[in-house]
Amino acid sequence: VPRWRQQWSGPGTTKRFPETVLARCVKYTEIHPEMRHVDCQSVWDAFKGAFISKHPCNITEEDYQPLMKLGTQTVPCNKILLWSRIKDLAHQFTQVQRDMFTLEDTLLGYLADDLTWCGEFNTSKINYQSCPDWRKDCSNNPVSVFWKTVSRRFAEAACDVVHVMLNGSRSKIFDKNSTFGSVEVHNLQPEKVQTLEAWVIHGGREDSRDLCQDPTIKELESIISKRNIQFSCKNIYRPDKFLQCVKNPEDSSCTSEI
């Protein structure tokens, strides 16, 4: 008799999820000498243990603590780049400027980037059919709780000047409901972080408006200032030229229009 299975609104676990996580772990620890000591089988076991046999709407940060412990990693606290709704450019930037780090440049972020996963209560099966959607089903699902946990820890570790890349093409450049707006902003430590510098990325070539004056950016500034952290904002009108300059700061085009 086929067993009844909960039908969720979101896509199911990414196919070959265990193999993908394990392969990513091996690759990451090979590339990053400081993480060579990590036992990837133990990492997978801890990852699996966070959600297997548990109701996918009843996951807690506590469930991920064994994984967090195994994935403990020190990144330079003054070289952190947060992002909101502009992941690809943030990753392009850290690929060029190798001394800066997004969450996905850390082991745990790298393992889970772009993946979906969930299990089922009381069975050791992974659900490849569907997983809970944050809005339509529940917020305490395995994926959302994972990102909330690692994002909080990443923000807590930051110091000095913290940078955040924001998407200037969106109606809410700063969105209080994004991971950045709801988790990271509130977990920056004022005793360690002096300044949050927002980089607003413009989408259109002809767009020369000062998006640092946008009401949502002013809202971000207000939140940050109330937390006794200075705020700075920069318009990046031509992200392509910006990346070029990061690659080649000596280039004369970093000053001129050419």
Epitope: R238, D240, F242, C245, S253, C254
Partner: nanobody
Amino acid sequence: QVQLQESGGGLVQPGGSLRLSCVASGSISNIITMGWYRQAPGKQREFVARIIIGGSTGYSDSVKGRFTISRDNTGNTWYLQMNSLKPEDTAVYYCNAGNPGTRYIYWGQGTQVTVSS
């Protein structure tokens, strides 16, 4: 509009050090590259150093290893630490700011650096 103000120039002996500062005021949200240029008497203005937001830096070959560019945590002041100065470093030093691919390009008035015994 952005205003740039340099300071820190002066007379120094060969082998000595100076630190130039540039303070930006006005629409500093449009500044994402900050740099230094110099112009010696009878010569063209030449690139010295540049720093991009996020910290990427570049230098001309003639100053590499001797000069260091940096910016403060507020982002509206940047510096040029000049060590092991040579007579050929004598010039008017201009700070520069901009936003690549746009018309936002700004210059300071310049500060004189003279290296002589």
